[in-house]
């Protein structure tokens, strides 16, 4: 779970070791500040929890990916 | 550790309704979701359908809609499970157990309750 | 729906042999998201494989499993007595998350 010691920086401490299914995503931001021990993501899944992942997995990456597309594309 | 305690056994007349408790402890009820099963005698597990608190999502087996109602109580950490109309069909044994909203698999089980249906 | 067809129906082995349990989906199970429960009689279900190859907490190494998109097996290396029970698999991609139909795993 991303931890907010200090308002408004929320850091993760430790990655999910699970891989999640896109279906299970709704979208994600990208965590870099310097005020943090390490770069993540963090996902937003359908239920309303929030996840810390490792960008460097490809699972992670990929992940990213399709939401940036499903973001792009236009909802008729 | 956590631990799904269910209500007792039930009998029930055909037409009734019978609603069944699924209490939680040593979790944080809000953070995982509830799903129903139930098990005929001699027959295999039968998913009717789940609540996710955190959400507010509930999804029923299309078998059951209509005729199965489940709610959360967040304040006393309870789950429900109400089946209406019911028949000897229904006579079996419900079971509630935990998952994990994001996966799904069931990780944590009640103990069950047996609820006859019977004239 | 995703149907899910487990085979056997019944597998008669003596402890020590090796069991492989199979389970079938009529459309593929994304990301691997099925689990194996094992349910002995007058006790509820308990949890054994997650995402298709996962041993739940506790779960001995005899019990693993494998497979993906529409194939899936449970194998038990070598019967101990108190596996002789009946193993479900089960989906959870997609709602209703449905349930095969069960093997029974008893002795010879």
């Known amino acids: 779970q991303p931890d907010a010691i200090n308002a408004p920086v929320t850091c993760c401490y430790n990655f999910t070791n699970r891989k999640i299914s896109v279906q299970r995503l709704a979208s994600y931001r990208r965590i870099t500040s310097s005020k943090c021990p390490k770069e993540a993501v963090i996902f937003k899944t359908i239920v309303a929890k929030e996840i810390c992942a490792d960008p460097k997995q490809k699972w992670v990456q990929d992940s990213m990916d399709h939401l940036d597309k499903q973001t792009q594309t236009p909802k008729t | 550790q956590v631990e799904l305690v269910q209500s007792g056994a039930e009998v029930k007349k055909p037409g009734s309704s019978v609603k069944v408790s699924c209490k939680a402890s040593?979790?944080?009820?809000?953070?995982?979701?509830i799903s129903w099963v139930r098990q005929a005698p001699g027959q295999g597990l039968e998913w009717m359908g789940a609540i996710n608190p955190l959400a507010g999502h509930t999804h029923y087996a299309q078998k059951f809609q209509g005729r199965v109602t489940i709610t959360a109580d967040e304040s006393t950490s309870t789950a429900y499970m109400e089946l209406s109309s019911l028949r000897s069909e229904d006579t079996a044994v419900y079971y509630c157990?935990?998952?994990?909203?994001?996966?799904?698999?069931?990780?944590?089980w009640g103990q069950g309750t047996l609820v006859t249906v019977s004239s | 729906d995703i149907v899910l067809t487990q085979s056997p129906a019944t597998l008669s082995l003596s402890p020590g042999e090796r069991a492989t349990l199979s389970c079938r989906a009529s459309?593929?199970?994304?990301?691997?998201?099925l689990a194996w429960y094992q349910q002995k009689p007058g006790q509820a279900p308990r949890l054994l494989i997650y995402?298709?190859?996962s041993r739940a907490t506790g779960v001995p190494a005899r019990f693993s499993g494998s497979g993906s998109g529409t194939d899936f097996t449970l194998t038990i290396s070598s019967l101990e007595p108190e596996d002789f029970a009946v193993y479900y698999c089960?989906?959870?991609?997609?709602?209703?998350?449905?349930f095969g139909q069960g093997t029974k795993v008893e002795i010879k």
């Open positions: 459309q593929s199970v994304s990301d691997a998201y």
């Open positions: 089960q989906q959870y991609i997609s709602f209703p998350a449905t």
């Open positions: 157990a935990r998952y994990d909203g994001i996966y799904g698999e069931l990780d944590f």
């Open positions: 995402d298709a190859s």
């Open positions: 040593g979790g944080t009820f809000s953070s995982y979701g």
